[in-house]
């Protein structure tokens, strides 16, 4: 039985050319996190592994920075970065927990952070 919940930054928006931090947090479980994957649709952005630390996919190396914590920082944003992002927590013994974040990259300067929400 998986008792944990993933809290994410939810629906967020940011300005073109700027940067944004994607954050997830796993709570309500004593499971041990063994790895966190960050994915954009079906593309792997980065991995944070308990043994090996961070690995950033080569195609994103220039624009993706690890952290803070288990989060991911996206830099030099373009309109093409708009879309769904997923944090995938691999845990023992529970298995996999997934959180979803929707990022909208705006041309104007009216970008505003959305509210937090939870995914069981």
């Amino acid at each position: 039985m998986m008792t944990g919940t993933i809290e994410t930054t939810g629906n967020i928006s940011a300005e073109k050319g700027g940067s944004i931090i994607l954050q997830c947090h796993l709570s309500s479980t004593t499971a041990q996190v063994t790895q966190v994957n960050w994915e954009q649709q079906d593309q792997l952005l980065a991995i944070c592994n308990a043994d090996l630390g961070w690995h950033i996919s080569p195609s994103f190396k220039d624009r993706v920075a690890p952290g803070p914590g288990l989060g991911l920082t996206l830099q030099s944003l373009t309109v093409n970065d708009t879309g769904e992002y997923f944090c995938i927590y691999h845990t023992y013994p529970d298995g996999t927990y997934t959180g979803r974040i929707f990022l909208e990259v705006l041309e104007s300067s009216v970008a505003e952070h959305g509210a937090r929400f939870q995914i069981p």
Partner: antibody, heavy 121, light 108 residues
Amino acid sequence: EVQLVESGGGLVQPGGSLKLSCAASGFTFSGAWMDWVRQAPGKGLEWVAEIRTKVNNHATNYGESVKGRFTISRDDSKSTVYLQMNSLRAEDTAVYYCRGALYDGFYFDYWGQGTLVTVSS
Amino acid sequence: EIVLTQSPATLSLSPGERATLSCSASSSVSSGYLYWYQQKPGQAPKLWIYGTSTLASGVPARFSGSGSGTDYTLTISSLEPEDFAVYYCHQWSSFPYTFGQGTKLEIK
């Protein structure tokens, strides 16, 4: 070969302090979550504290009887976990075991041979 | 705190007999977080069963584990001389982690 070697035990007066160390080898220490478990003479096992991996923000958790008095820490560069014990009481007298647990597709659970802490005046 | 109560406290049996050790939790434990340890005099405990039913490396197939919720069991189908020891159940489903008081399996 996996080894966990505890050290730092001994005789200490009530109210005193002691720092235990546990040196690990033979497995990927940075990926292991580490615990201290104790066993009073002739008694059962009691969980004392844990420290998680970097991916788990090196989170620490404690048993009720030691909370606020004991502090667990780790140094991944030295593959060592520590237990700083303050305000020691007679009821803290026990063999203290270091335990390491690791999951990399298979679950592993390793224990040291223990170090004896005696709190007495 | 989840209190684990093991029964019986002592179990006296002969080699070849079947042994059933019970562990009852004061509130529900997720099955992945219920472990059994074996301890012999003067030795550190050894992981015996994890995740309720998975045998640790090197543990003979005569051992099995089962249960869910608040009731868990370790069974030895036919006792061998080396099985006589103290067995502890352990949960890390919620803080603080706890152990049962142990069942001593002794030769009759």
